[in-house]
């Protein structure tokens, strides 16, 4: 199963950690995909390492762990984020986070 904070908030210009936690007695994680709505943010492969989409490479930092640190947030970053865990033996698990970017006070 995937465990995550369903709703998180952060300030404009600040940063936020996007994190999902996967737990299973039998399956091991082989890849994690991170998407902003339908747009790829980054992929982590246990064997191949990290790939960060070029359009986000200046704002997305891999980690901590299998999560992402999203920096220099703008109001346009408000929305749904999805983590997809690929496991072996086969199985796909998906988590959802809603990020609300608030005006800096």
């Amino acid at each position: 199963t995937i465990d995550t904070k369903r709703n998180i908030s952060a300030e404009e210009g600040g940063s936020v950690i996007l994190q999902c936690h996967f737990s299973s007695d039998t399956a091991e994680v082989t890849q994690v995909d991170w998407k902003q709505q339908d747009q790829l943010l980054a992929i982590y492969s246990v064997d191949l390492g990290w790939h960060v989409a070029s359009v986000f490479s200046d704002r997305v930092v891999p980690g901590p762990s299998l999560g992402l640190t999203f920096q220099s947030l703008t109001m346009n970053d408000t929305g749904e984020y999805f983590c997809t865990y690929h496991t072996y033996p086969g199985g796909i698990y998906k988590g959802r986070i809603f990020l609300k970017v608030q005006e800096s006070s």
Partner: antibody
Framework: QVQLQESGPGLVKPSETLSLTCTVS??????????LAWIRQPPGKGLEWIGS???????YYNPSLESRVTISVDTSKNQFSLKLSSVTAADTAVYYC?????????????????WGQGTMVTVSS | EIVMTQSPATLSVSPGERATLSCRAS??????LAWYQQKPGQAPRLLIY???TRATGIPARFSGSGSGTEFTLTISSLQSEDFAVYYC?????????FGGGTKVEIK
């Protein structure tokens, strides 16, 4: 540019073990960030993934073949190999070695980027 | 295991015409889909990855589309060298699986 070359016997007897080797040239397995894979194609049929190995030794196998398959890598020889035990006529096929995920870091996709030319293996007594 | 189903099994097309090949996944693979071309006696060649991105050196007449469970490979104007068998393949997750193939033949 990395190139692959399969080698091994073209004829194997039923119940014996099929052994194939893939030699990688133009790049070092020990430093390559990609999977080394085996795929087969029975005569007149489609493609079947057999399994993949990473340089660290992590292996992933087709569940339908897992009990009979061993894939290993020899970084000192820049080779990886396939062993398929207890073969039957149904294992007669062209066997391909391939590299998967060579462009992952740059482009974020995992696909079979590079293929060997294939070697035909017939199982018959 | 994700099952990939291709249709039609055979497609008869005249040179210069458009060919549309379909691939369906038994569950969502997002955009993690590749297309390969295989000519008789040759190894397959990667055409499309990420459902829609052409691999290096692949002509612009080849295009891929779709996401989730439904995918399409389109060859806009068939050339003589395009008559071949085409396979779709999902990756990840493990196990990697291929579709049964579509043979594009000369009408």
């Amino acid at each position: 540019q990395v190139q692959l070359q399969e080698s091994g016997p073209g004829l194997v007897k039923p119940s014996e073990t099929l052994s194939l080797t893939c030699t990688v040239s133009g790049g070092s397995i020990s430093s390559g960030s990609y999977y080394l894979a085996w795929i087969r194609q029975p005569p007149g049929k489609g493609l079947e993934w057999i399994g993949s190995i990473f340089r660290s030794g992590s292996t992933y196998y087709n569940p339908s073949l897992e009990s009979r398959v061993t894939i290993s890598v020899d970084t000192s020889k820049n080779q990886f190999s396939l062993k398929l035990s207890s073969v039957t006529a149904a294992d007669t096929a062209v066997y391909y070695c391939a590299i998967e995920g060579a462009n992952f870091k740059d482009f974020g996709y995992v696909a079979f980027d590079i293929w060997g030319q294939g070697t035909m293996v017939t199982v018959s007594s | 295991e994700i099952v990939m189903t291709q249709s039609p099994a055979t497609l008869s097309v005249s040179p210069g015409e458009r060919a549309t090949l379909s691939c369906r996944a038994s569950q969502s693979v997002s955009s993690n889909l590749a297309w390969y071309q295989q000519k008789p006696g040759q190894a397959p060649r990667l055409l499309i990855y990420g459902a829609s991105t052409r691999a290096t050196g692949i002509p612009a007449r080849f295009s891929g589309s779709g996401s989730g469970t439904e995918f399409t490979l389109t060859i806009s104007s068939l050339q003589s060298e395009d008559f071949a068998v085409y396979y779709c393949q999902q990756s990840p997750p493990w196990p990697r699986t291929f579709g049964g193939g579509t043979k594009v033949e000369i009408k």
